[in-house]
């Protein structure tokens, strides 16, 4: 299915991981400012705040070497963020491995920014994406991904770290976003709703997803997460739109199948290595682009994300699965980890392609509203 | 040379418990996984399942059709590979192979050598 | 779990002859396949790895191709003590299955 007010012919096309539909090619929502930490009343993101682990747990902070005391994403502190007053979150926190700064949950006390300053920054994330509003940049380049194609061996880890189920990569896996822009992966993360409600961070155009994968990468330019924390560019996240289809997704099965080993917050199991990119769209080509912040705390800038505008196609039950399965602290489900949208503030979101022409079938003569900013970067 | 030795089968009734050991030699042992695999009379072959090693916290993982009855265990000091066998059914009865693979030099699962087997019969 | 669809289950073969055995998986397993000789009695013994490879002392009458979901295993001359069952094996994910075995006979 498409986005809502997709065009009906947008090439969208199901991916190597059993993708199907690209985002509607709509627009990015152009303002996101401070970060609220609930979700406004009455709207869809019901959890409020962001659950990154992958962002919040950065794995190893520095893929680099390994001997070297990296930092990892889940070293970084971790704050309890509101949530949506009227949405009762599933309070997933996480005592970041006897962090003194290590607590946060979606939906509660304390606010995010009383945990994370950074929580309340103008530039902040995930933002709605609003293709009619996007601007088209032809030096946008389709995403180069290197290693991606894991062996069985070594095995990965797999762990329910209280608001996300993050896979850890390992080193070797480059990213590119265009020349001179490169990174490396760290680790990857997902975000879910509930039964019947939707829980991906990024909506386009007020749609919200089923679910949402989120690849954390490190710039190469930085050897520590930390030391790429809040630097413009320093960590760059690829985030995928995972939606309902009629076949089972092989590759996301080989991690939801392991679920049940990993139900228990704090729990972790050891999965066969894995072709990574087959967990994201097969068009690399296509996607919005924005500089937003890291989900969850400690929510910091800088963070550059490239939002696939092709979806993933998961089965029912593999959605199911993802939404049912684990549990968060105080017996609660780790279910709706997902932060509300934030305001642009005047950011303006990319597109790699002309999202707003002829995306929207209301829209009788598409008009691009904003221009590309960063032509040839 | 590199050889796995096994011992341990018998008959034993529908029920009961019965343990496999696997005696390793020739090669590191801590380096490597070890796995189960069985074989039913006139069938063909069915893995148990496998025992990580001490660097990848000693984890095991079983196949569906025997996790919560099976235990796989190891002694490095002693290199051996031990299948304990408990609520043992008639559809268990197999030739039980102890199997070496996953080295950490290794991209994949391919078991390259073989214990000689043993033939577990599970009857009243 | 991945399946794993062997073919043909039997076939016989006179000495010389080129075999050829197929492997067909349920899903994409990359290059992690292996092929097995079983004799009569005896435990099976490691031929190809990783589709293609060939193990350590097997003779070079055995080889092994494909990648993705199918896979070939051939034997170019067939030799009497060629005798056995074969089996594939994926290595891709666990549960590790095997393919239900393909017997060879000499005509």
């Known amino acids: 299915q498409r986005l809502p007010r997709m065009q009906e012919d947008s090439p969208l096309g199901g991916g190597s991981s059993g993708e199907d539909d690209p985002l509607g090619e709509e627009d990015l929502p152009s303002e996101e400012d401070s970060p609220r930490e609930e979700d406004p009343p009455g709207e869809e993101d019901l959890p409020g705040e962001e659950d990154l682990p992958g962002e919040e747990d950065l794995p190893e902070v520095k893929p680099k070497s390994e001997e070297e005391g990296s930092l990892k994403l889940e070293d970084l502190p971790t704050v309890e963020a509101p949530g949506d007053p009227q949405e009762p979150q599933n309070n997933a926190h996480r005592d970041k491995e006897g962090d003194d700064q290590s607590h946060w949950r979606y939906g509660g006390d304390p606010p995010w920014p009383r945990v994370s300053p950074a929580c309340a920054g103008r530039f902040q994330s995930p933002v709605d994406i609003r293709p009619q509003l996007a601007a088209f940049c032809p030096a946008l380049r389709p995403l180069e991904l290197l290693g991606f194609q894991l062996p069985p061996l070594p095995e990965l880890r797999l762990r329910n770290n209280g608001h996300s189920v993050q896979l850890t990569l390992p080193p070797g896996l480059e990213m590119a976003l265009g020349p001179g822009r490169e990174y490396r992966a760290l680790q990857l993360h997902l975000h879910w709703g509930a039964a019947g409600r939707p829980g991906s961070e990024h909506t386009v155009e007020g749609h919200r997803f089923p679910a949402e994968i989120h690849v954390v990468h490190l710039s190469t330019a930085f050897a520590r997460v930390d030391e790429a924390l809040g630097r413009p560019g320093g960590l760059a996240v690829l985030a995928a739109f995972l939606e309902e289809g009629p076949e089972e997704n092989s590759a996301y099965e080989q991690l939801l199948s392991r679920l049940e080993e990993i139900a228990e917050e704090g729990s972790e199991t050891q999965v066969p290595g894995l072709d990574i990119s087959a967990l994201l769209p097969s068009d690399f080509s296509r996607y919005f682009q924005y500089e937003g912040s890291l989900t969850t705390p400690p929510c910091a800038q800088g963070v550059i994300w490239t939002v696939f505008n092709q979806t993933v196609m998961l089965s029912a039950k593999q959605l199911h699965t993802l939404s049912d399965t684990l549990w968060g602290p105080g017996d609660s489900r780790l279910q709706l980890n997902f932060r509300a949208t934030q305001p642009l503030n005047g950011r303006v979101i990319e597109a790699s392609f002309p999202a707003g022409v002829d995306s929207s079938p209301r829209a009788a003569e598409p008009v691009q509203l904003n221009s590309c900013l960063a032509a040839g970067d | 040379q590199v050889q796995l030795v096994q011992s341990g089968g018998g008959l034993v009734q529908p029920g009961r418990s019965l343990r496999l050991s696997c005696t390793a030699s020739g090669f590191t042992f801590t380096d490597y996984y070890m796995h189960w695999v069985r074989q039913a009379p006139g069938k063909g072959l069915e893995w148990v399942g496998f025992i990580r090693n001490k660097a990848s916290g000693y984890t095991p993982q079983y196949s569906a059709s025997v996790k919560g009855r099976f235990t796989i265990s190891r002694d490095d000091s002693k290199t051996i590979a031990y299948l304990q066998m408990n609520s043992l059914k008639t559809e268990d009865t197999a030739v039980y192979y102890c199997v070496r693979g996953g080295h950490a030099g290794s991209n994949y699962w391919y078991f390259d050598v073989w214990g000689q087997g043993t033939l577990v019969t599970v009857s009243s | 779990d991945i399946q794993m669809t062997q073919s043909p289950s039997s076939l016989s073969a006179s000495v010389g002859d080129r075999v050829t055995i197929t492997c067909h998986v349920s899903q994409n397993i990359n290059v992690w396949l292996s092929w097995y000789q079983q004799k009569p009695g005896k435990a099976p013994k490691l031929l190809i790895y990783?589709?293609?490879n060939l193990h350590t002392g097997v003779p070079s009458r055995f080889s092994g191709s494909g990648s993705g979901t199918d896979f070939t295993f051939t034997i170019s001359s067939l030799q009497p003590e060629d005798i056995a069952t074969y089996y594939c094996?994926?290595?891709?994910?666990?549960?590790?299955?095997f393919g239900q075995g393909t017997k060879l006979e000499i005509k």
């Open positions: 990783q589709a293609s």
């Open positions: 094996q994926q290595g891709q994910s666990y549960p590790f299955t």
